[in-house]
C-alpha cells in the first residue's frame, strides 16, 4: 500500500525531538503553498492554506516517520502554529510506483488578508538536540481584497470588492481629464485623485443613481499615463474601502462626449 | 523482460566530447532513477558517477564528476544520455548506465560502452 | 563522502569450498547495502540487495548479513560459475561508492 497522511495539531516540541537517533531522515526536497477556498456551509467560506511537499528521493526516507509543518503570520496580531502529519505506511520506494517523487499536501491554516506568513517544515524525526535540524522554510505573503479568491470574504465585500467601477479616463486636453466610472449601490460618495509624482487633479463626486457617470476633472499638467485613484465611501466601510486605478489614455475621435449637466460633475479640489 | 542498450564502443580525440547512449525497454521508463558508473579498467573499481530521474530530470552528481558529465533523458524514446566533456586519457574506461530498483540498488545493467580517449 | 572498505582484495579458493567477503562503511547506512559479481569482460549483476535480499535467480549458496557499519558476503559451496569480482555499494544517501571490489579466483 502507498502512504498516505494523516495531519492533526502538534504543540511545542515533537515527542522524538527529546529521544537520541543515531539515523535520521533527509529534509524536504521542496516546499509551496497556495490559496484554496473552501466552503464551511451555504454562502460562507473560509480561505486556507494548501501546503505541499515533496520527499528527497533517497533510502533515508525509509527513517521517515512524520512531516511538520508550522506557519507564524506577522500582522496587526502575531501567530504561530503547527501540525504533524503522519505517514501511514513505511516507504517501500524511493520514488511513486507511476513515477516522480512522493508528493504530499496538508490544507488548513486560515488565512488573513494581506499577511506576510512564513511556512516551515522538517522531517520526523529531526536532528538531535544541538545538532543543525534540517527544515525548509517559505515566506508567503497573502494577497488583499482584490484577489479572485479573497475578494469574496465578508470582509472584503463590504469593503466593495466585488464592484467592478471599470474606470475610464483620457486626456480631453492639456488641462481637462474625463473620468468615467460606474457607481457603486452601496453609495454615494467619491473621490477621484489623478497623480503622476504628485497630485495632477483632484474631484469630490456624489451620485445616487446606479449608473456610469462622468466626471470632468482640471489638470495641473501633462496627464497621460498618469494613474487614475478612485475611492469609494460605502456604508460598510466608511473610510476604509477598496481604492481602484486606472490610467488617463488620450481620448480618441469616438470617445463619448461629456453628458450634459445632470449627469456631470465638476468640482475642482 | 528489462533491457538497457549501450553501444560497444567510442574512440574520441583528447579535448573533444562524446554522447553516450542507454536505450532502454520492458519497463515503465519514467519510474526509476538512472545512474551511470564508471569502471576505469579490467579488475578497476566502479564509481558512481551520477543519476537522473527521468519523470522530471532531476539530476544529483558525484561531486567529482559534475564538471565533467552532464546527464540527460529523452523520454519519447526512453533513452538516458551521458555527454562526456573536455575528454583527456583519464577518462578512458567503460561506462555503464544502471537502472535502479525501488532504491538505488542496481537491479539492472547496460552492457558498458568503452570510451578510448587517443 | 560514505567510504566502503572490501576484503580481502584478492582470495584463492577451491570449488566447494565456503568464502565470505566483507564490507565496512565509514558511518552507519542503515541497512542500505547491496552486493554484485562481475564476470570478466561483463557488466555487473545484482546479487543482494538491503543486506540479505537475493536478486532474482541468484543461487541460495549465497547469503548477506550485517548491520550499521559492517556487511559481509557468504557463498556456501563454491561453483565453478561463482569466479570473478564482487563489489558492495552502499545506497544511504548520494553520493554512492562501491568497495575496491574482491577478486575470487580458482586455486
Known amino acids: 500500500r502507498e502512504p498516505t497522511i494523516q495531519c492533526g495539531s502538534e504543540t511545542g516540541p515533537s515527542p522524538e525531538w527529546m529521544v537520541q537517533h543515531t539515523l535520521t531522515p533527509g529534509d524536504l526536497r521542496d516546499l509551496q503553498v497556495e490559496l484554496v477556498k473552501t466552503s464551511v456551509a451555504a454562502e460562507e467560506f473560509s480561505i486556507l492554506m494548501n501546503i505541499s511537499w515533496i520527499l528527497r528521493a533517497d533510502a533515508s526516507i525509509r527513517l521517515l516517520k512524520a512531516t511538520k509543518i508550522c506557519v507564524s503570520g506577522k500582522n496587526n496580531m502575531n501567530s504561530y502554529s503547527c501540525v504533524r502529519c503522519n505517514y501511514t505506511e513505511a516507504f517501500q520506494s524511493q520514488t511513486r510506483p507511476s513515477g516522480g517523487k512522493w508528493t504530499f499536501s496538508y490544507v488548513g491554516f486560515p488565512v488573513e488578508l494581506s499577511t506576510l506568513y512564513l511556512i516551515s517544515a522538517h522531517n520526523i524525526p529531526n536532528a538531535n538536540m544541538n545538532e543543525d535540524s534540517p527544515s525548509l522554510s517559505v515566506n508567503f505573503t497573502s494577497p488583499g481584497c482584490l484577489n479572485h479568491v479573497m475578494k469574496y470574504k465578508k470582509q472584503c465585500t463590504e469593503a466593495g470588492s466585488l464592484w467592478d467601477p471599470d474606470i475610464t479616463a483620457c486626456k480631453k486636453n492639456e488641462k481637462m481629464v474625463e473620468v468615467n466610472f460606474t457607481t457603486n449601490p452601496l453609495g454615494n460618495r467619491y473621490t477621484i485623485l489623478i497623480q503622476r509624482d504628485t497630485t495632477l487633479g483632484f474631484s469630490r463626486v456624489l451620485e445616487n443613481k446606479l449608473m456610469r457617470t462622468s466626471v470632468a476633472i482640471p489638470v495641473t499638467e501633462e496627464s497621460e499615463g498618469a494613474v487614475v485613484q478612485l475611492t469609494p465611501y460605502l456604508h460598510t466601510c466608511g473610510n476604509d474601502c477598496i481604492r481602484r486605478e486606472g490610467t488617463v489614455v488620450l481620448c480618441s475621435e469616438t470617445s463619448a462626449p461629456i453628458p450634459p449637466d445632470d449627469n456631470r460633475r465638476m468640482l475642482g479640489g | 523482460q528489462v533491457q538497457l542498450q549501450q553501444p560497444g564502443a567510442e574512440l574520441v580525440r583528447p579535448g573533444a566530447s562524446v554522447k553516450l547512449s542507454c536505450k532502454t525497454s520492458g519497463y515503465t521508463f519514467i519510474s526509476y532513477w538512472m545512474n551511470w558508473v564508471k569502471q576505469g579498467g579490467p579488475e578497476q573499481g566502479l564509481e558512481w558517477i551520477g543519476r537522473i530521474d527521468p519523470y522530471d530530470s532531476e539530476i544529483q552528481y558525484n561531486q567529482k564528476f559534475k564538471d565533467k558529465a552532464i546527464l540527460t533523458v529523452d523520454k519519447s524514446s526512453s533513452a538516458a544520455y551521458m555527454q562526456l566533456i573536455s575528454l583527456t586519457s583519464e577518462d578512458s574506461a567503460v561506462y555503464y548506465c544502471?537502472?535502479?530498483?525501488?532504491?538505488?540498488?542496481?537491479?539492472?545493467w547496460g552492457q558498458g560502452t568503452l570510451v578510448t580517449v587517443s | 563522502d560514505i567510504q566502503m572498505t572490501q576484503s580481502p582484495a584478492s582470495l584463492s579458493v577451491s570449488v566447494g569450498e565456503t568464502v565470505t567477503i566483507t564490507c565496512r562503511a565509514s558511518e552507519n547506512i542503515n541497512s542500505n547495502l547491496a552486493w554484485y559479481q562481475q564476470k570478466k569482460g561483463k557488466s555487473p549483476q545484482l546479487l543482494v540487495y538491503?543486506?540479505?535480499n537475493l536478486a532474482d535467480g541468484v543461487p541460495s549458496r549465497f547469503s548477506g548479513s550485517g548491520s550499521g557499519t559492517q556487511y559481509s558476503l557468504k557463498i556456501n559451496s563454491l561453483q565453478s560459475e561463482d569466479f570473478g569480482s564482487y563489489y558492495c555499494?552502499?545506497?544511504?544517501?548520494?553520493?554512492?561508492?562501491f568497495g575496491g571490489g574482491t577478486n575470487l579466483e580458482i586455486k
Open positions: 538491503d543486506v540479505t
Open positions: 544502471a537502472r535502479s530498483g525501488g532504491f538505488d540498488w542496481f537491479a539492472y
Open positions: 555499494q552502499h545506497f544511504w544517501r548520494p553520493p554512492y561508492t
